[in-house]
């Protein structure tokens, strides 16, 4: 008989290489039986995982699995790092493996003026 525990299917040491300035959806695959659990995302800062409260999230339901999605619109250089999703189920906290975003800044400092320089052109 299949387990009715909540399961989070993020692979151990999974990574995503993404570009700053474009959108990205980070998916947490969630398997549950009856009631959908409360799921949150957090970002690792050393040994603590800081809950992402002001970020846009959504659910995508598929036949055999659901996805809790963290939206990046767009990806920022500061989004580089490791993330984890967690589910609250029957007073139990289930945590996923961490998944890492490797963000490439497509406008590196060498080829791109700062916002202040750009703004000064705006005012010129």
């Amino acid at each position: 008989k299949e387990s009715c525990d909540v399961q989070l299917y993020i692979k151990r040491q999974s990574e995503h290489s993404i570009l700053a300035g474009d959108p990205f959806e980070l998916e947490c695959p969630v398997k549950y039986c009856a009631n959908r659990p409360h799921v949150t995302w957090c970002k690792l800062n050393g040994t603590t995982c800081v809950k992402l409260e002001d970020r846009q999230t959504s659910w995508k339901e598929e036949k055999n699995i659901s996805f809790f999605i963290l939206h990046f619109e767009p990806v920022l250089p500061n989004d580089n790092g490791s993330y984890r999703c967690s589910a609250n189920f029957q007073s139990n906290l289930i945590e996923s493996h961490s998944t890492t975003l490797r963000v490439t800044d497509v406008k590196s400092a060498s080829e791109r003026p700062s916002k202040d320089e750009m703004a000064s052109r705006f005012w010129a």
Epitope: L19, D22, Q56, P77, F122
Partner: antibody, heavy 120, light 106 residues
């Protein structure tokens, strides 16, 4: 020098479609996103959608079913198409460049806008 | 969607007076942008990410806030500051603007 310039029809009949072109210079559409924002006396400033550098789009869910944004990177042009216009779509339509810093995203350069009136 | 409510809608200030306008969000946002618009012109970026002045903006302007409450302050009002100021959130789609505060000079 960064510039964005909108060109539109000015007058559109009710139930017809609207097409506006935004021609940009001073930056590449493969590096920066371009947004569409409209301003009407009744609704104030309203974000409509964005064409991201990689070619994906995001839309405001309210008018999304009537909106389409596309681009031609080689011509440095972004296009807004809106179907089934009604009188409350009368507004000034702006194309706006989006840019990111380390930890935030903002719209920095605005076009001068193109005025669209929906009337028979 | 996140609704941004600006108050007051209209504000009249004398030269040299301190001016504060507020922007309240219906849900918590990460940061707030502010734009200035004068009649017949496009909006101009004025304050980025709550407190960073856009280049060319006089130092008498400042921004502050967090969560659902943000404000723009002018330490000493000048005639050239008369304009409409809009707050704008980039935390959740649809990315919304406030209704604006029209600042007039007495």
């Amino acid at each position: 020098q960064v510039q964005l310039k909108e060109s539109g029809p000015g007058l559109v009949a009710p139930s017809q479609s609207l097409s506006i072109t935004c021609t940009v210079s001073g930056f590449s559409l493969t590096t920066y996103g371009v947004h569409w924002v409209r301003q009407s006396p009744g609704k104030g400033l309203e974000w409509l959608g964005v064409m991201w550098p990689g070619g994906r789009t995001s839309y405001n869910p309210a008018p999304m079913s009537r909106l389409s944004i596309s681009k031609d990177n080689s011509k440095s042009q972004v296009f807004l198409k809106m179907n089934s216009l009604q009188t409350d779509d009368t507004a000034m339509y702006y194309c706006v460049r989006g840019d990111y810093e380390y930890d935030y995203y903002a719209m920095d350069y605005w076009g001068q806008g193109t005025s669209v009136t929906v009337s028979s | 969607q996140i609704v941004l409510s600006q108050s007051p809608a209209i504000l009249s200030a004398s030269p040299g007076e301190k001016v504060t306008m507020t922007c309240r969000a219906s849900s918590s946002v990460s940061y707030m942008h502010w734009y200035q618009q004068k009649p017949g012109s496009s909006p101009k970026p004025w304050i980025y990410a709550t407190s960073n002045l856009a280049s060319g903006v006089p130092a008498r302007f400042s921004g502050s806030g967090s969560g659902t409450s943000y404000s723009l302050t002018i330490s000493r009002m000048e005639a050239e500051d008369a304009a409409t100021y809009y707050c704008h959130q980039w935390s959740s789609n649809p990315y919304t603007f406030g209704g604006g505060t029209k600042l007039e000079i007495k």
